[in-house]
């Protein structure tokens, strides 16, 4: 979707099957107000963008309402009447789901179940990443619904969690974007913490029976 086109770089993001954002970076036209013309059907006339994004006072993108549209976006970026770049793109290939909402944690001994509100459309993966200060990298688990149980946790350790949503590649293709991460939440002994200590605290000595 990027690629140089007469010096024009294009990026498309379909936010949560609600809004399409098309942005361009045209070095050759850096001081020019390029116009964006589009249609969602090959038979329609082009409409001009009514919601431009501006960068340094010049047009650099367009936001389009496109709620739950199973459509091709046909568009033309023009300098006056001269088309600078014309293309057609299947919008859902560029899906970016919204960040998980209402994230909740339910603890039971050495396991936690992370839940959140499922999005209104399917074929998504809900990914939970977690780590303790003892871990060198994030661990990950994902499920088809926002109900992810992680087992084998150490009740004495503090764990940081965050959650995101990804589109399934075999349904939406390889060019989608994962959602933004939810806020990091820290937990220890089933209770929420402000943060996990960067340097791990030494484990408490076990009392002999």
């Amino acid at each position: 979707q990027g690629g140089a086109a007469e010096g024009v770089q294009i990026q498309i993001i379909y936010f949560n099957l609600e809004t399409v954002q098309v942005t361009w970076n045209a070095s050759k036209y850096s001081r020019t107000n390029l116009t964006f013309h589009y249609r969602f059907n090959g038979d329609e006339a082009y409409d001009q963008c009514t919601n431009y994004l501006l960068q340094e006072g010049h047009t650099s993108g367009c936001l389009l309402d496109a709620e739950q549209r199973d459509d091709i976006l046909y568009f033309s970026i023009r300098n006056g009447t001269h088309p600078v770049f014309t293309a057609s793109r299947w919008m859902v290939y560029y899906l970016k789901p919204s960040s998980p909402k209402h994230v909740r944690f339910s603890w039971h001994q050495d396991a936690v179940t992370v839940t959140c509100s499922d999005l209104s459309y399917g074929d998504l993966l809900y990914e939970v990443q977690y780590r303790s200060p003892f871990d060198t990298e994030w661990q990950s688990k994902q499920e088809n619904t926002c109900n992810v149980t992680i087992e084998g946790l150490d009740a004495e350790k503090c764990y940081s969690f965050w959650v995101r949503v990804k589109a399934m590649e075999d349904v939406y293709g390889p060019d989608t974007y994962p959602s933004d991460w939810s806020e990091v939440t820290c937990w220890q002994r089933g209770e929420i913490r402000d943060a996990c200590a960067e340097t791990p605290t030494p484990p408490k000595p076990k009392l002999s029976k």
């Epitope: 690629g3 091709i72 014309t86 060019d175």
Partner: antibody
Framework: QVQLQESGPGLVKPSGTLSLTCAVS?????????WSWVRQPPGKGLEWIGE???????NNNPSLKSRVTISVDKSKSQFSLKLSSVTAADTAVYYC???????????WGQGTLVTVSS | DIQMTQSPSTLSASVGDRVTITCRAS??????LAWYQQKPGKAPKLLIY???SLESGVPSRFSGSGSGTEFTLTISSLQPDDFATYYC????????FGQGTKLEIK
Amino acid sequence: QVQLQESGPGLVKPSGTLSLTCAVSGGSISSSNWWSWVRQPPGKGLEWIGEIYHGGTTNNNPSLKSRVTISVDKSKSQFSLKLSSVTAADTAVYYCARHRYSNGLDYWGQGTLVTVSS
Amino acid sequence: DIQMTQSPSTLSASVGDRVTITCRASQSISNWLAWYQQKPGKAPKLLIYKASSLESGVPSRFSGSGSGTEFTLTISSLQPDDFATYYCQQYNHYSTFGQGTKLEIK
């Protein structure tokens, strides 16, 4: 391994409608691929006719658009082409193919010759 | 519509030669271009997609380059199996094929 197989009449009368079906096996027609039709008149080059997504959205060659109908039947794992008001110029080998994401036509049927003649 | 012009129409070469086929788009297509090989009586075979990505299973002697309006397919050392007709295809806006380049034995 995805396989595609075209089927339909090999002879169509002028002004009639050409109808072809492409059966998809070895992969899901409901994947994120597009399903395409391409034709090749005898001794000539390739011409893109159009394509369809499993949800029914189509993207057709503007020069043929008014005559072309592409449809999909997910339950039968097949997609179809109808080309109306045919003339001798529509005589060609017709291929169905899979358009993988944004990466070209990676699987093709073996092609079927359709002759338009009275 | 976007027109694709291939050159040359016919190319005579020998086994071991390095050959280049050019494809020019009538307007910018970014890198949304594929190359195909077709042999008589057979369906086309995908060689290169996104202008320069080699399709799985295709020998590395095939390579593609270019962006915008100018693209090339290069075969670094021709093999007997490479004599065929080659087509470029843009899929940036609708889709269009070039008219083909027939690669024949000199």
